[in-house]
Each structure stands twice: as structure tokens, then as C-alpha cells.
Interface confidence: low
């Protein structure tokens, strides 16, 4: 297993609809054709896996049907979008990239993107 550098933004604020997007960029040492991207969340000293996708270079990322993540790839960049976020989902979201094929296998883990989620205030009752 060889190490690889992964860069991602330090902070992202989710939209009022609970959607957060960020770019995960990896320094590919070779011509990878198969890449696996995993988003991890770290909060309260617990790490969880949010979503994962394997894709062939140049193709769309395919997450599981019930995943809260979507994404697109462009060269060595992956544009990730996480949906359905609530205030309780605030935390450090870490991008993990694996170059699966061809060998050798490379692994890179970013420093994480702190995603802040603020639940929208309910609209006050109004006669208008």
C-alpha cells in the first residue's frame, strides 16, 4: 500500500436545504483506471462511513441507491454532494481515495472538511 496526497476544503456550510458540496482532489502518481472514493464522518470521537463509490476514470460515480451522496469526477478531482443533512450531522467529513487498478494500490486520506449544518427556522404563522 502506497501513500497518496488528498486535498479537500477546510470548511463548508450546508445550504438551508441541507445540501453540502465539496471537491476532493488527489495527487495520482500514475494512470489509475479504477478509483474508489469513501466519505467518512468524524464526530464525538467516533468515525462513521457516510458513503462510498467505485468508478472508472471518465465515468460517473455510482453510489448505492439509498445513499445520501452523489458525485462527479473530472481528472483527479471528485465533486461530492451530500444531501439530507441536519444540524446533528455537523462534523468533519473526510475524503478517502483508493486507486484500485492497475497496481500498485494507492491510499490517500484527506484532512477533512468541517461541514456546518444549521436547521432552518420554521416560518412563523402568518395571515398573508
Amino acid at each position: 500500500c502506497k501513500a497518496m496526497h488528498v486535498a479537500q476544503p477546510a470548511v463548508v456550510l450546508a445550504s438551508s436545504r441541507g445540501i453540502a458540496s465539496f471537491v476532493c482532489e488527489y495527487a495520482s502518481p500514475g494512470k489509475a483506471t479504477e478509483v474508489r472514493v469513501t466519505v467518512l464522518r468524524q464526530a464525538d470521537s467516533q468515525v462513521t462511513e457516510v458513503c462510498a463509490a467505485t468508478y472508472m476514470m471518465g465515468n460517473e460515480l455510482t453510489f448505492l441507491d439509498d445513499s445520501i451522496c452523489t458525485g462527479t469526477s473530472s481528472g483527479n478531482q471528485v465533486n461530492l454532494t451530500i444531501q439530507g443533512l441536519r444540524a446533528m450531522d455537523t462534523g468533519l467529513y473526510i475524503c478517502k481515495v483508493e486507486l484500485m487498478y492497475p497496481p500498485p494500490y494507492y491510499l490517500g486520506i484527506g484532512n477533512g472538511t468541517q461541514i456546518y449544518v444549521i436547521d432552518p427556522e420554521p416560518c412563523p404563522d402568518s395571515d398573508f
Epitope: 474508489r36 469513501t38 464522518r41 462513521t48 462511513e49 457516510v50
Partner: nanobody, 125 residues
Framework: EVQLVESGGGLVQPGGSLRLSCAAS????????MAWFRQAPGKEREFVSA????????AYADSVKGRFTISRDNSKNTLYLQMNSLRAEDTAVYYC??????????????????WGQGTLVTVSS
């Protein structure tokens, strides 16, 4: 309904290896986090290791870190625990369990909804 059946236990000498398997039936098993727990004679059941739904994330108890490896094959609905450098204190009944969430790797029993019957691992010379 999820059913879990463990296998692979047995008698092994200290320093030896064993590979436990847990065959799962039911869709929930392959789409949720899974874990291994163990219960030594006269002791409470304790967390050993857990793995996320896609296998991308794992967690281990400090006592087994570097010796045990958890993995899963969702195409076969099977969870594995490779145990190396076994010690006498690893003697226990090993249980596999299915968590109620996809991604969260919990360390406490009450976070797991389905349990197998267990397989006995005895480490002795």
C-alpha cells in the same frame, strides 16, 4: 427476518490462527454494519470488531488490534473474522451481530438488533 449462523470455531494452540465466518440471510444484513462480540466464561459480552455496510471502514477493540482482521463479502452475505496470534485470553464464545444502521460502528450490544448463536473458540496448549 435476519438469521445469522457462525462457524469456524474450535480448539487452537496459543500463537495459532482461526477464521470465523458468519453466514447471514435477509437483506438487512448486507446493507447494515456488522460486528463481532465475544463472551468469555464468567464474563460479560464484549465488543471485538465492527465493519461498515460496504466494508470501507472497520473498528477494533484495543485487545485485538493488529491480531484480528474483520472483513465481509456482501455477494455471499458473509462476515469474517481472521484471528492470528491467538492467546489464552481470547478463549470465548464469538457472536456476530447486525447493526440497525448502515454506517455507524457501535461498540455497545444494544445497538445491534440481530445476533447469531455463537461459536466457541478455545485457545489452549
Amino acid at each position: 427476518e435476519v438469521q445469522l449462523v457462525e462457524s469456524g470455531g474450535g480448539l487452537v494452540q496459543p500463537g495459532g490462527s482461526l477464521r470465523l465466518s458468519c453466514a447471514a440471510s435477509g437483506r438487512t444484513a448486507s446493507s447494515n454494519a456488522m460486528a463481532w462480540f465475544r463472551q468469555a466464561p464468567g464474563k460479560e459480552r464484549e465488543f471485538v470488531s465492527a465493519i461498515s455496510a460496504t466494508g470501507g471502514l472497520t473498528a477494533y477493540a484495543d485487545s485485538v488490534k493488529g491480531r484480528f482482521t474483520i472483513s465481509r463479502d456482501n455477494s455471499k452475505n458473509t462476515l469474517y473474522l481472521q484471528m492470528n496470534s491467538l492467546r489464552a485470553e481470547d478463549t470465548a464464545v464469538y457472536y456476530c451481530a447486525v447493526g440497525r444502521e448502515r454506517w455507524y460502528l457501535r461498540h455497545t450490544e444494544n445497538e445491534y438488533d440481530y445476533w447469531g448463536q455463537g461459536t466457541l473458540v478455545t485457545v489452549s496448549s
